[in-house]
């Protein structure tokens, strides 16, 4: 189905022919066409004419799902690395191939491209050091991660480095900038006048993504950066560091890229596919790289770096973690150990490297030209325990129980599609190569992706992050899931979620957050308009602080992690396991789209109020400039009426006419393309979505009507005024523009 | 359980070289920094080496800076120390011991909290 490079022997044979022989088997085709098409619709099952899936296909889907299968599956997939690139991750590739075969997809293919990758010099070890006054190293932080038992006389696990950091020996004193956030530049900016300038940076890891991290440190005009994990943020009170609890060791390092792709995908090959015949661009022309060289470190090597810390103190608490060192901001050392500096040794290397998505295809019986998507990545940093094989040995179960299904004689009405996503944490590379690949027709026939990455972040509640569409799917499915959490047995899935992460808007019902990035939703969501949604079981953020879970991207992320300390019993997997193969089932089967158009119209009116709060903090200025939001109101009124009419046409429209069926669900699937703007957000080309965007400044977070809120951004410090609040008049009407637009695709059609 | 084995000791001329062994067992030898203390007789203990767990920190008393060079194998959890240039005030029994910071790789500022039971060196003429 995707090759669509590679000619078959039919059609070159076709290409011989002669024309009339052609046309004539053209007009003979089309008439059996006709005649089947008529006699199809007489004989229509009555089933085929209802919205409710038959409760025993859903039943029967659900029961086959085994907490025992998850298990065995990620044991499976965590007894080696497998770092995007390799030969391991090739080989497990191939293992997922045949092993999909073998469940019985209709087709399961690989495929390959090109990518640039980031890799540490196996000879030439990154590192940091403290250096005296004649250069000589007094101190070095650590080459690699002590490994874990069991686990020592594994090769190939790669030292903790930032993916893509370019190459430098940089020099200087040390400034602390807390999490490198936009504030916290800020604040020593423009409160303590502290300059970056040539300075090596140390900031904790947490809040905001690691690459606008960098990105800021770099604006801050920065010669390196230091991440570092505080335990304030990655260890949690009153538990033991691995190997006896789920907690970092001091010697635990984070790795990951630091990239602002910005959703570009390979930064050679911006927009298109990193194929045999791609142009690539030369790497200074590269997309999203970081310019300064960039090195994370665990809490033991930072208490050395910041122990000696001098000059201006900490301005408040927020800027203190956990370690026993002052947290003064500096620049440099104190006192006696003020001629020494920091110096950086990195000598990583990008290069082009081969890597492999596994696509897995289960044929639609009624609507084989509608896309459902089950995709997650499956490359990890080290041994992946939970990220991504949490996920991908979900995806698995997920996948031998619809083969299940299908060798039993059943299919879904729509084809399902699974993903195995290369290079995740290169950047989302695997998934957004693939879809530059079939972008026409992912956006003539995608109705929703589902993304499975990590299936627990803890084991305390349901998270789930997606598109307003998938709400009521969500709420409606969970109901009819049976919670796995202690204190609720016999009680629904959506009861024990509502009462541990209650909706801060309405009483009674739990929260769904926007979709951000950082995962590999991101292309088919924020660029292609596909309805989106993920979920995930997730700590308790009101009592557990620390930023994602402790070991995350460390070597000790290992299968023991997820068996003795998280989820003995796999429940939170399967529970997991059952939301997503859930949602793809219910997608995938449904007569018409389980999607509901008012929950957008609601959040848009709450987007708009919110954004036009954020304008009206500066009431001075949209009365001199004549700034309105009356259009952007009109408009959502506008969506919100024309969608409660689809709404009653949907309950009461003739669901056995075909013709109509296809006509009201093709209007639900192309709402959320609607939201698309073919030309971008300023300066971000590939996020196109109007409503939703990565945060600019956490490229984790989603951000509401983004356009907008950029351009009102520190809109004070705009040393053109003027020109400034015409960018935010100019944004209001493209989202005024986009919502009005949406709202017309709802109308009825003639 | 937790052991440490030193060996490699003996007498040896002044200027004379020594490599001492120590075999470690019982315990993730690749998490640990190590470290080298010597008696002398009728002295007290001195510290006079330690390398970290992944041998990016090495660190020597003034005594010995330029003659002895600490090194490990952690795919044979093996610690050693190189001697050179012996001096009869290098005469002691020498014990290798861990490090009871797992996952450090800082200075040797912390107490140790396995010992080895000694290999005795003799710079005699």
């Known amino acids: 189905m995707w090759n669509l490079l590679h000619e078959t022997d039919s059609a070159v044979a076709t290409a011989r022919r002669p024309r009339w022989l052609c046309a004539g088997a053209l007009v003979l085709a089309g008439g059996f066409f006709l005649l089947g098409f008529l006699f199809g619709w007489f004989i229509k099952s009555s089933s085929e004419a209802t919205n409710i899936t038959p409760k025993h296909n859903m039943k029967a889907f659900l029961d086959e799902l085994k907490a025992e299968n998850i298990k065995k599956f990620l044991h499976n997939f965590t007894q080696i690395p497998h770092l995007a690139g390799t030969e391991q991750n090739f080989q497990l590739a191939k293992q997922i191939q045949s092993q999909w075969k073998e469940f019985g997809l209709d087709s399961v293919e690989l495929t390959h491209y090109d990518v640039l990758l980031s890799y540490p010099n196996k000879t030439h070890p990154n590192y940091i050091s403290i250096i005296n006054e004649d250069g000589n190293e007094i101190f070095n932080t650590s080459l690699f991660e002590p490994p874990p038992a069991g686990y020592e006389n594994v090769s190939d696990i790669v030292p903790p480095f930032s993916a893509f950091s370019p190459q430098g020996m940089p020099e200087g004193d040390l400034v602390y900038v807390n999490y490198a956030r936009t504030e916290d530049f800020f604040k020593l900016e423009r409160d303590m006048k502290i300059n970056c300038s040539g300075k090596i940076v140390i900031a904790r890891y947490g809040k905001v993504f690691r690459g606008n991290k960098v990105k800021n440190a770099q604006l801050a005009g920065a010669t390196g950066v230091i991440l570092y994990s505080d335990p304030a943020d990655y260890f949690a009170p009153g538990v033991k560091s691995y190997p006896d609890g789920w907690n970092l060791p001091g010697g635990g390092v984070q790795r990951g890229n630091i990239l602002n792709l910005n959703g570009a995908g390979d930064p050679l090959t911006p927009g298109y596919p990193a194929n045999e015949y791609a142009y690539r661009r030369g790497i200074a022309e590269a997309v999203g790289l970081p310019s300064i060289p960039v090195h994370p470190i665990g809490y033991y090597d930072a208490q050395k770096l910041l122990e000696k810390m001098g000059g201006s103190a900490s301005p408040d608490s927020s800027w203190r973690g956990s370690l026993k060192v002052p947290y003064n901001v500096g620049p440099g050392f104190t006192g006696n150990f003020s001629t020494q500096k920091v110096k950086m040794h990195i000598h990583s290397t990008s290069e082009v490297t081969r890597i492999y998505n596994v696509i897995g295809t289960l044929r639609g019986a009624v609507e084989p030209d509608r896309y459902v998507i089950l995709g997650g990545h499956r490359d990890s940093w080290v041994f992946g325990g939970i990220d991504p094989q949490s996920g991908a040995a979900v995806v698995h179960e997920i996948v031998r129980s619809f083969g299940t299904l299908k060798k039993e004689g059943w299919r879904p009405r729509r084809t399902i599609l699974f993903a195995s996503w290369d290079a995740e944490e290169f950047g989302l590379l695997g998934s957004t190569e693939w879809a530059e690949e079939n972008s026409r027709l992912l956006q003539e026939r995608g109705v929703a992706y589902i993304n499975a990455d990590s299936s627990i972040e803890g084991n305390y509640t349901l998270r789930v992050d997606c598109t307003p569409l998938m709400y009521s799917l969500v709420y409606n499915l969970t109901k009819e899931l049976e919670s796995p959490d202690e204190g609720f047995e016999g009680k629904s899935l959506y009861e024990s979620w509502t009462k541990k992460s209650p909706s801060p808007e309405f009483s009674g019902m739990p929260r769904i957050s926007k979709l951000g990035s950082g995962n590999d939703f991101e292309v088919f969501f924020q660029r292609l308009g596909i309805a989106s949604g993920r979920a995930r079981y997730t700590k308790n953020w009101e009592t557990n602080k620390f930023s994602s879970y402790p070991l995350y991207h460390s070597v000790y992320e290992t299968y023991e992690l997820v068996e003795k300390f998280y989820d003995p019993m796999f429940k939170y997997h399967l529970t997991v396991a059952q939301v997503r193969g859930g949602m793809v089932f219910e997608l995938a089967n449904s007569v018409v789209l389980p999607f509901d158009c008012r929950d957008y119209a609601v959040v848009l009116r709450k987007y708009a109020d919110k954004i036009y709060n954020i304008s009206m903090k500066h009431p001075q200025e949209m009365k001199t400039y004549s700034v309105s939001f009356d259009s952007l109101f009109s408009a959502v009124k506008n969506f919100t009426e024309i969608a409660s009419k689809f709404s009653e046409r949907l309950r009461d429209f003739d669901k056995s006419n075909p013709i109509l069926l296809r006509m009201m669900n093709d209007q639900l699937m192309f709402l959320e393309r609607a939201f698309i703007d073919p030309l971008g957000l300023p300066d971000r080309p590939f996020y196109r979505h109007v409503i939703y965007a990565p945060s600019s400044h956490n490229k984790y977070a989603g951000e509401s009507f983004p356009g907008i809120y950029d351009a009102l951004f520190d809109i004070e410090s705009k040393v053109d005024p003027s020109q400034a609040w015409g960018e935010v008049k100019r944004q209001i009407s493209i989202a005024t523009f986009t919502v009005q637009a949406a709202a017309e695709t709802l109308s009825e059609v003639a | 359980q937790v052991q440490l084995v030193e060996s490699g000791g003996g007498l040896v001329q002044p200027g004379g070289s020594l490599r001492l062994s120590c075999a470690a067992s019982?315990?993730?030898?690749?998490?640990?920094?190590m470290h080298w203390v010597r008696q002398a007789p009728g002295k007290g203990l001195e510290w006079v080496a330690f390398?970290?767990?992944?041998?990016?920190?090495?660190y020597y008393v003034d005594s010995v800076k330029g003659r002895f060079t600490i090194s490990r194998d952690n795919s044979k959890n093996t610690l050693y120390l190189q001697m050179n240039s012996l001096r009869a005030e290098d005469t002691a029994v020498y014990y290798c011991?861990?490090?009871?910071?797992?996952?450090?790789?800082?200075?040797?500022?912390?107490?140790?909290?396995?010992w080895g039971q000694g290999t005795t060196v003799t710079v005699s003429s």
């Open positions: 019982g315990f993730t030898f690749s998490s640990y920094g």
């Open positions: 390398m970290s767990y992944d041998g990016s920190n090495k």
């Open positions: 011991a861990k490090g009871d910071y797992d996952f450090w790789s800082g200075y040797p500022d912390y107490d140790m909290d396995v």
